[in-house]
Interface confidence: medium
């Protein structure tokens, strides 16, 4: 399996909410001995190996934000800790998983990584990640809504907040 990032760049105004998304592609084993660990973290731009550094998102580590379940099951992070920081990660039945960040500030700008680890009992792990950039803007030239730029082309499209 592999991870796809539908959008490589999110440009959002300060104070807006945004949902960063990754998608699990390819065959996914659904056996009893297979579970999936999905999480999010920040990383540094310009690394030789993108996403190799794991930094917290709003003081929450990748362990705090993880989802742990089998196959294409739906899951959400435990609400209390994450929601106090304006965060929520979620996963659906179709392999999509996301992190929602509320009330964006300029400090939220940066490179975000999603990580999927396939854990087979008595076997080795298989891990893949995806990366995307979030730019939070302020001032009269910041967009009114979050604008997302697809990974495959330069066309942009709006996520309508209202």
């Amino acid at each position: 399996f592999k991870v796809a990032t539908p959008y490589s760049l999110y440009v959002c105004p300060e104070g807006q909410n945004v949902t960063l998304t990754c998608r699990l592609l390819g065959p996914v084993d659904k056996g009893h001995d297979v579970t999936f660990y999905k999480t999010w973290y920040r990383s540094s731009r310009g690394e030789v190996q993108t996403c190799s550094e794991r930094r917290p998102i709003r003081n929450l580590t990748f362990q705090d934000l993880h989802l742990h379940h089998g196959g294409h099951q739906a899951a959400n992070t435990s609400h209390d800790l994450a929601q106090r920081h304006g965060l929520e990660s979620a996963s659906d039945h179709h392999g999509n998983f996301s992190i929602t960040m509320r009330n964006l500030t300029l400090l939220d700008s940066g490179l975000y990584c999603c990580l999927v680890v396939e854990i087979r009992h008595h076997h080795s792990e298989h891990r893949v990640h995806g990366a995307m950039e979030l730019q939070v803007q302020t001032g009269k030239d910041a967009p009114s809504n979050c604008v997302v730029y697809p990974s495959s082309s330069q066309d942009s499209e709006n996520i309508t907040a209202a």
């Epitope: 104070g15 807006q16 009330n103 030239d141 709006n158 309508t160």
Partner: antibody
Framework: QVQLVQSGAEVKKPGASVKVSCKAS????????MHWVRQAPGQGLEWMGY????????EYNQKFKDRVTMTRDTSTSTVYMELSSLRSEDTAVYYC???????????WGQGTTVTVSS | DIVMTQSPDSLAVSLGERATINCKSS????????????LAWYQQKPGQPPKLLIY???TRESGVPDRFSGSGSGTDFTLTISSLQAEDVAVYYC????????FGQGTKLEIK
């Protein structure tokens, strides 16, 4: 550079309707909300409402809710503000203003004077 | 609706002197989550559309002279012109965008 060009002055009779246009250029039209603000002679600024050009979603000042309609044409990057059942108190300069990410009116049209007189 | 009240309605200040305009909102404009006040100041000269000066209560818009400054939080805000210039003669408006949008009634600034 960002430009908002509004339609010309209008003279209308009470009870009629007026439709003012605002053509945008120099930026991606669908990325920014457009607001309408009016100013009666010698008076202050009054926010009328906004339209999200991407979705067409509108939100209006309660004062104008039953009389105002804001629309957009993405093919020409133009927004429209129509005000119906005009009365003399609607005599004003009507401005379109582009929203920025800090909920700012950072760019304004030149204004359209609407005179309501019998 | 949030009501914005400016004071004074008009103000005459000598060239080179300080001008201060106040704006009070009927409820707090502070978003505590991002420590941001949804309050902006605009300048309008005769026959022209308004021009953005200050946003988020205290952030000066690019290109605006540094003699203009904004301060305050919550419900009480101030626009200060540290040394009045002839070109600063105008009407000044505060505007809230915390809950939809409302302008103050305006303050007319003249030279004494």
């Amino acid at each position: 550079q960002v430009q908002l060009v509004q339609s010309g002055a209008e003279v209308k009779k009470p009870g009629a309707s007026v439709k003012v246009s605002c053509k945008a250029s120099g930026y991606t039209f669908t990325n920014y909300w457009m607001h309408w603000v009016r100013q009666a002679p010698g008076q202050g600024l009054e926010w009328m409402g906004y339209i999200n050009p991407s979705s067409g979603y509108t939100e209006y000042n309660q004062k104008f809710k039953d009389r105002v309609t804001m629309t957009r044409d993405t093919s020409t990057s133009t927004v429209y503000m129509e005000l119906s059942s005009l009365r003399s108190e609607d005599t004003a300069v009507y401005y379109c203003a582009r929203d920025g990410g800090s909920v700012l009116f950072g760019y304004w049209g030149q204004g359209t004077t609407v005179t309501v007189s019998s | 609706d949030i009501v914005m009240t400016q004071s004074p309605d008009s103000l005459a200040v000598s060239l080179g002197e300080r001008a201060t305009i106040n704006c009070k909102s009927s409820q707090s404009l502070l978003n505590s989550g991002i420590r941001k006040n949804y309050l902006a100041w605009y300048q309008q000269k005769p026959g022209q559309p308004p021009k953005l000066l200050i946003y988020s209560a205290s952030t000066r818009e690019s290109g605006v002279p540094d003699r203009f400054s904004g301060s305050g939080s919550g419900t009480d805000f101030t626009l200060t012109i540290s040394s009045l210039q002839a070109e600063d003669v105008a009407v000044y408006y505060c505007k809230q965008s915390y809950n939809l949008y409302t302008f103050g009634q305006g303050t007319k600034l003249e030279i004494k």
